[in-house]
């Protein structure tokens, strides 16, 4: 009896395992070997395909076959017994296009409130993925054990801590990778659960904010008590995407180690310019908080993003408002080289109910105002670039008052 | 592979001061820390300090400040500490070890034993 | 300084029993906790780290677990090569700080 070739021949490629699948085309003959050939492009002769040759199952394993992953390639698959089948040809691939990113491996830490994930790619040293290494993004899903809601988080890097959990409280959550030059998104790693510490003593420092003053730097924190000492450190940011490192070499801020107020002054010559990652941490002498939230920080943005200068000219329905350039120390103005947009805030003097106007022109009229009364103005500048979101602090408020009636001309 | 080798034993005598080293192999040492732990015959294991290679700085315990300094060379991928005015409670093995972030102190040099006597 | 101790300092056991050693610190320190086994005259044996992770090449019958101030290592089958001293170690702040370890001998 002839032999019939085997059919409905799948290839399947995660990461750099590559197998083989095919439907036996005659389930009543036993006994039955399965053999594959492979051809390169451009290449008349057919191969011996290793690790699947005389195949008893209906899956092979040919990894160790060192293939140029961007080349394409053909396959070929026959029946054995006595005699052969017929080759069937499968259609010619290129492994790079048909290989799916594989489950990433994922290491967790937990804090009371927090979860760090250390997330790295299954096979270390990939060759189908050895140019794109350093492009992988990771998507998570992260949910409570207990009420199982899911939340995702996209487009993180190889370490990502989520802040904000409740304690002693387990949390579970899977990662997969993507590749976006490629339009690649990979396989879901296992479930990963862990619980969160009891609640630390100490809680972390918030609300961190970066100001300049002069040549300086002014950094503020809130805390919940008072006795404590403080001490902050940096990290250059693109060392989150670096894939290989899981270590981060955090740097202290000398002028901040070891500081005894919810402040720190530091030169702006500390920083080169680039943007870094800060993140604040008390202690009491005997117990040390967990590490604040991180904030990013533009050296770029943030030494030129001052309160903005005004003039006010009183009518006695409304104020003309001027903006020009902040000033420097030693009276210089600062040039702004990218597109600001100005948030002004005013009240009346004897009340707390502040009004709000935002504006991208240097002159604002502030319309409806009551003569003779004193209002009260404050200002500030944001960048309207998405990437770069940074407001200036508020400026100080000035206080004027309208002119009496029938002055608006 | 990845290895620390550190020098030979010695002797020293009350007062004086021991420098040891740690060469590093299979691994670039400026993407890692070097950690410095000691242990006296016996006992057990005592952190003294860290150096970051890639710019030499370093943390100390309260214990050994002022009387230790670790240094590096990264020509030559190798770290050193160095312990001053030494006692005879000195005489320990001190070893080096590599840190690697949460996988912590996850290769140990063979330790060298460092022997304060008159 | 945080603080680290661990119970008990000596165990006695025999081949295939299961044995736990516990360590607490004095503070939260999360899970920046990392054991390792020592034999007379050898280095340190890096065997878990950040808890409850293992070292490759670390048998599965070692394993760790606990967060926050409370730490166990777990042998659950303890074999010839297993009768060492243990130590934890905090790598959350510094100081770091050791256990004073545990002894595990032949009964």
């Known amino acids: 009896k002839n032999l019939k070739s085997p059919q409905k021949v799948e290839v399947d490629i995660i990461d750099d395992n590559f197998i083989l699948r095919w439907n036996r085309s005659d389930e009543s003959v036993g006994n039955v070997t399965f053999s594959f050939d492979y051809q390169k492009t451009g290449m008349d002769n057919w191969i011996k395909l290793s690790g699947c040759q005389n195949i008893t199952s209906t899956k092979c394993n040919f990894s160790s076959l060192k293939l140029n992953v961007y080349e394409e390639i053909k396959l070929r698959i026959r029946a054995e017994k006595e005699n052969t089948s017929s080759w069937y040809e499968v259609d010619s691939f290129t492994p790079f296009r048909k290989a799916q990113i594989g489950p990433p491996e994922v290491h967790l830490e937990a804090e009371d409130k927090a979860i760090v994930i250390h997330i790295s790619p299954g096979t270390k040293d990939s060759v189908m993925w050895a140019l794109d290494g350093l492009s992988f993004t990771y998507s998570l899903v992260i949910w409570k054990n207990s009420s199982g809601v899911e939340e995702r988080i996209e487009n993180i890097y190889s370490r990502h801590k989520i802040y904000k959990l409740s304690p002693e409280t387990t949390y579970c959550l899977k990662v997969k990778a993507a590749l976006l030059t490629s339009w690649k998104i990979g396989v879901y790693s296992p479930v990963h659960c862990i619980k969160t510490t009891v609640e630390n003593e100490l809680p972390p420092p918030e609300n961190i904010e970066v100001s300049v003053q002069n040549q300086n730097y002014v950094l503020k924190w809130d805390y919940t008590y008072a006795n404590m000492t403080f001490q902050v450190q940096w990290l250059h940011a693109f060392l989150k995407r670096n894939p290989g490192n899981h270590l981060y070499k955090w740097k202290q801020i000398p002028d901040c180690e070891n500081v005894k107020t919810t402040q720190c002054v530091f030169p702006q010559n500390v920083f080169q310019k680039g943007i870094y990652l800060l993140r604040v941490q008390a202690s009491d002498g005997n117990n040390t908080s967990f590490w604040s939230e991180e904030i990013k920080f533009d050296t770029e943005i943030q030494a030129f993003l001052l309160p903005p200068v005004f003039n006010i000219r009183s009518l006695s329905d409304s104020f003309h408002i001027y903006i020009g350039a902040p000033k420097q120390s030693g009276n210089t103005p600062v040039i702004q080289d990218y597109p600001l947009i100005y948030e002004i805030i005013f009240w009346e003097n004897t009340s707390n109910a502040e009004r709000k106007i935002i504006e991208k022109k240097t002159d604002v009229t502030v319309p409806n105002l009551k003569p003779l009364t004193v209002y009260c103005v404050k200002a500030r500048a944001h960048t309207m670039d998405e990437k770069l979101n940074k407001s200036s602090v508020f400026s100080d408020a000035v206080c004027e008052k309208t002119k009496p009636g029938n002055t608006s001309k | 592979q990845v290895q620390l080798v550190q020098s030979g034993a010695e002797v020293k005598k009350p007062g004086a001061s021991v420098k040891v080293s740690c060469k590093a192999s299979g691994f670039n040492i400026k993407d890692y820390y070097i950690h410095w732990v000691r242990q006296a015959p016996g006992q057990g294991l005592e952190w003294m300090g860290r150096?970051?290679?890639?710019?030499?700085?370093?943390k100390y315990a309260p214990k050994f400040q002022g009387r230790v300094t670790m240094t590096r060379d990264t020509s030559i991928s190798t770290a050193y500490m160095e312990l001053s005015r030494l006692r005879s409670d000195d005489t320990v093995v001190y070893y080096c070890?590599?840190?690697?972030?949460?996988?912590?102190?996850?290769?140990w040099g063979q330790g060298t034993l460092v022997t304060v006597s008159s | 300084d945080i603080q680290m101790t661990q119970s008990p300092s000596s165990l006695s056991t025999s081949v295939g029993d299961r044995v736990t050693i516990t360590c607490k610190t004095s503070q939260n320190v999360g899970t920046n906790v990392a054991w390792y086994q020592q034999k007379p005259g050898k280095a340190p044996k890096p065997l878990i780290y950040?808890?409850?992770y293992r070292y490759s090449g670390v048998p599965s019958r070692f394993s760790g677990s606990g967060s926050g101030t409370d730490f166990t290592l777990t042998i659950s089958s303890v074999q010839p090569e297993d009768f060492a001293t243990y130590y934890c170690?905090?790598?959350?702040?510094?100081?770091?700080?050791f256990g004073p370890g545990t002894k595990l001998d032949i009964k």
């Open positions: 170690h905090q790598y959350f702040s510094y100081p770091y700080t």
């Open positions: 070890a590599r840190y690697h972030g949460y996988w912590a102190l996850d290769y």
């Open positions: 950040s808890t409850s």
């Open positions: 150096i970051d290679p890639e710019d030499a700085e370093t």
